[in-house]
């Protein structure tokens, strides 16, 4: 049975600033690189037929659901892209994480401007601070890491706060063992 294709992002963030670039790639088993990929944005078929969909100079209209399909194989699970205009944007490697998997958080400054005194918060409590911008890395996520995250920082000497982001860590499914 052919596997469903999977959409991956490069850079890996599904929340980006207006004007930034992101490449969506339709990955699957033994798919030909010829023009055989269908891309769907908010349900509408895109003109792009390559296995990669490049979003250059992102606009707000680029926000939404993306799916891909190779030949007549099942559609991929959807990936949701959101385009923002703000001073700070909290980006996560994933918003739903399987327990035991890594989780990375990034407090991204508009136009890649320097951000100082960056503090990450979880459920309203400070998680970690540093004098310059820095990332948060959780090697093995646990259910306790679920929560609402945001970051604050200084850009051009002024204080800003990102929009909050809900992160959910789900328990890994139990392996099923069948007695012979």
């Amino acid at each position: 049975v052919p596997q469903k294709p999977k959409v991956s992002l490069n850079p890996p963030w599904n929340r980006i600033f207006k004007g930034e670039n992101v490449t969506l790639t339709c990955n699957g088993n033994n798919f030909f690189e010829v023009s055989s990929t269908k891309w769907f944005h908010n349900g509408s078929l895109s003109e792009e037929t390559n296995s990669s969909l490049n979003i250059v100079n992102a606009k707000f209209e680029d926000s939404g659901e993306y799916k891909c399909q190779h030949q007549q194989v099942n559609e991929s699970e959807p990936v949701y892209l959101e385009v923002f205009s703000d001073w700070l944007l909290l980006q996560a490697s994933a918003e739903v994480v399987m327990e035991g998997q890594p989780l990375f958080l990034r407090c991204h400054g508009w136009r890649n401007w320097d951000v100082y005194k960056v503090i990450y918060y979880k459920d309203g409590e400070a998680l970690k601070y540093w004098y310059e911008n820095h990332n948060i890395s959780i090697t093995n996520a646990t259910v306790e890491d679920s929560g609402t995250y945001y970051c604050t920082g200084k850009v051009w000497q002024l204080d800003y706060e990102s929009e909050p982001l809900n992160i959910t860590v789900i328990k890994a499914p139990r392996e099923k063992y069948w007695l012979q």
């Epitope: 100082y116 503090i119 004098y131 200084k154």
Partner: antibody
Framework: EVQLVQSGAEVKKPGESLKISCKGS????????IGWVRQMPGKGLEWMGI????????RYSPSFQGQVTISADKSMSSAYLQWNSLKASDTAMYYC?????????????WGQGTTVTVSS | QSALTQPASVSGSPGQSITISCVGT?????????VSWYQQHPGRAPKLIIY???RRPSEISNRFSASKSGNTASLTISGLQAEDEADYYC??????????VFGTRTKVTVL
């Protein structure tokens, strides 16, 4: 009262190992960076390294990288400075100090210092 | 990472003002608004007197003030008093891997 209390003075021989401690109280120990500072007799302050007890993220001064190990134990609200093989040149006063917090720059709470003497 | 450069000694009479300089580079003092100042009396632990270039902890006298221009930070002690006689150190952020580097030490003498 916010304070850092350091372990007592140590007299050691060259080649011996040592671990000194710094216990925090009166604040959320895991939420502030803790730095270590060396002061050799009659000399100035030298920054050695810093640790965030919340996740044990550690940064070392290039001068001390590989010479010492900085660690922390959340359950004990303590930070540690360790040597595997002491040298006579390690004779100094060692201070731990807490960062101001919130990304503000400075060390606002200091331990009383631990005197380490290394002599054969 | 080289230490920041401070004058070895500065002196003044009671009631006078003195200024201690702390010279860095465009990669530390010149780049970041992260400078702190410490006072150390003989046999005592250092004490924070200025953080974030100009900010004073609440318990520190307003006779202590600080500023920064280019690659140089300065600490001014006004209305000099006998208890101000001590060693003074500046510190600056240099990089994420080396956040603290101290100055060379200035001995303040009250004449």
């Amino acid at each position: 009262e916010v304070q850092l209390v350091q372990s007592g003075a140590e007299v050691k021989k060259p080649g011996e190992s040592l671990k000194i401690s710094c216990k925090g109280s009166g604040y959320s120990f895991t939420s502030y960076w803790i730095g270590w500072v060396r002061q050799m007799p009659g000399k100035g302050l030298e920054w050695m390294g810093i640790i965030y007890p919340g996740d044990s993220d550690t940064r070392y001064s290039p001068s001390f990288q590989g010479q010492v190990t900085i660690s922390a134990d959340k359950s004990m609200s303590s930070a540690y400075l360790q040597w595997n093989s002491l040298k006579a040149s390690d004779t100094a006063m060692y201070y731990c100090a807490r960062d101001v917090g919130n990304g503000d720059y400075g060390l606002d709470v200091w331990g009383q210092g631990t005197t380490v003497t290394v002599s054969s | 990472q080289s230490a920041l450069t401070q004058p070895a000694s500065v002196s003044g009479s009671p009631g006078q003002s003195i200024t201690i300089s702390c010279v860095g580079t465009s990669g530390d003092i010149g780049r970041f608004n992260y400078v702190s100042w410490y006072q150390q009396h003989p046999g005592r632990a250092p004490k924070l007197i200025i953080y974030d270039v100009t900010r004073r902890p609440s318990e520190i006298s307003n006779r202590f003030s600080a500023s920064k221009s280019g690659n140089t930070a300065s600490l001014t002690i006004s209305g000099l008093q006998a208890e101000d006689e001590a060693d003074y150190y500046c510190s600056s952020y240099t990089s994420s891997s080396t956040p603290y580097v101290f100055g060379t030490r200035t001995k303040v003498t009250v004449l």
